[in-house]
């Protein structure tokens, strides 16, 4: 994780900063949302547990043509140790519920903020 984050500052950043940057980006998305996010696209809901970052990326990467979440997708790829491509579901253990991207982002944000407040940066 020490190589994460080059979006806001050059060079390596600590894991706490990388997580903070991801939270900031998700906050910006939720606060700046005017029309339905990504035209109301639906994505697979995920379990917010171990492997969450890869699962989140695998779910969101299937949304194309949505500039609002492109930065989030790039950030999540920095947290996920393996390469993720569209249609790949190795980390999405349960694929039974689809939700709107906007709700997905809100749920992810709440969980990431809790991790940050707890000091769980890795």
């Amino acid at each position: 994780l020490t190589c994460l984050g080059g979006f806001a500052s050059p060079g390596p950043v600590p894991p706490s900063t990388a997580l903070r940057e991801l939270i900031e980006e998700l906050v910006n998305i939720t606060q700046n949302q005017k029309a339905p996010l990504c035209n109301g696209s639906m994505v697979w809901s995920i379990n917010l547990t171990a492997g969450m970052y890869c699962a989140a990326l695998e779910s969101l990467i299937n949304v194309s043509g949505c500039s609002a979440i492109e930065k989030t997708q790039r950030m999540l790829s920095g947290f996920c140790p393996h390469k993720v491509s569209a249609g790949q579901f190795s980390s999405l253990h349960v694929r039974d519920t689809k939700i709107e991207v906007a709700q997905f982002v809100k749920d992810l944000l709440l969980h990431l903020k809790k991790l940050f407040r707890e000091g769980q940066f890795n």
């Epitope: 806001a8 500052s9 706490s16 900063t17 903070r20 939270i23 900031e24 906050v27 606060q31 903020k113 809790k114 940050f116 407040r117 707890e118 000091g119």
Partner: antibody
């Protein structure tokens, strides 16, 4: 109106445990995004952050004092309690509680403070 | 821990003067810098959070700026009621840490 009020013993003997209570008015610690911090200020000196507790019971401490500190909340009474064990004269200070909110970014900015309670550690 | 260094430790200025107080962090705090005002015998009050956002009820003569490790609090026109000690505080990384304070007096 948001207000916080600290209460404490005033005088504590060395080696004893200091118990401080912060009563919250105008907001509830059961509300999402709310947190309460404890900060202290020795006479004529600067501010030192001690601990905080969030609405969902996430607790964080200053590592320099972590082994001696315990923070807890009583939502029904809208109170936050801080305990500091094995006190020493260097713990003499005004102890403040303050509110923190994390609705957007997590700023860790304390937007409302209590008036403070002076605690003297002396035999 | 992140060390916060304020300068000057004290200053004296005339009513109407522009006053600036500096705060330097030992590492990048990414704009998570808050300013407090403490009057003698009173609790601190939040003036500015996240470098430049004015807390509700704070007069517009107070402003904040900076980035990275260097931050500034400015009082555009000093008033008698601004006599106080001002503290910066970083909110980027726990433990939260404060600067040593800057005491502002009227000439």
């Amino acid at each position: 109106e948001v207000t916080l009020r600290e209460s404490g013993p005033g005088l504590v003997k060395p080696t004893q445990t200091l118990t401080l209570t912060c009563t919250l008015y105008g907001f509830s610690l059961s509300t999402s995004d709310m947190g309460v911090d404890w900060i202290r200020q020795p006479p004529g000196k600067g501010l030192e952050w001690l601990a905080h507790i969030w609405w969902d019971d996430v607790k964080r401490y200053n590592p320099a004092l972590k082994s001696r500190l315990t923070i807890s909340k009583d939502t029904s009474k809208n109170q936050v309690v801080l305990k500091l064990t094995s006190v020493d004269p260097v713990d003499t200070a005004t102890y403040y509680c303050a509110r923190t909110v994390s609705s957007g970014y997590i700023y860790y900015a304390m937007d409302y403070w209590g008036q403070g309670t002076l605690v003297t550690v002396s035999s | 821990d992140i060390q916060m260094t304020q300068s000057p430790s004290s200053l004296s200025a005339s009513v109407g003067d522009r006053v600036t107080i500096s705060c330097r962090a030992s590492q990048d705090i990414r704009n998570y810098l808050n300013w407090y005002q403490q009057k003698p015998g009173k609790a601190p009050k939040l003036l500015i959070f996240y470098t430049s956002k004015l807390h509700s009820g704070v007069p517009s003569r107070f402003s904040g700026s900076g980035s990275g490790t260097d931050y500034t609090l400015t009082i555009s026109s000093l008033q008698p009621e601004d006599i106080a000690t001002y503290y910066c505080q970083q909110g980027n990384t726990l433990p939260l840490t404060f600067g040593g304070g800057t005491k502002v007096e009227i000439k």
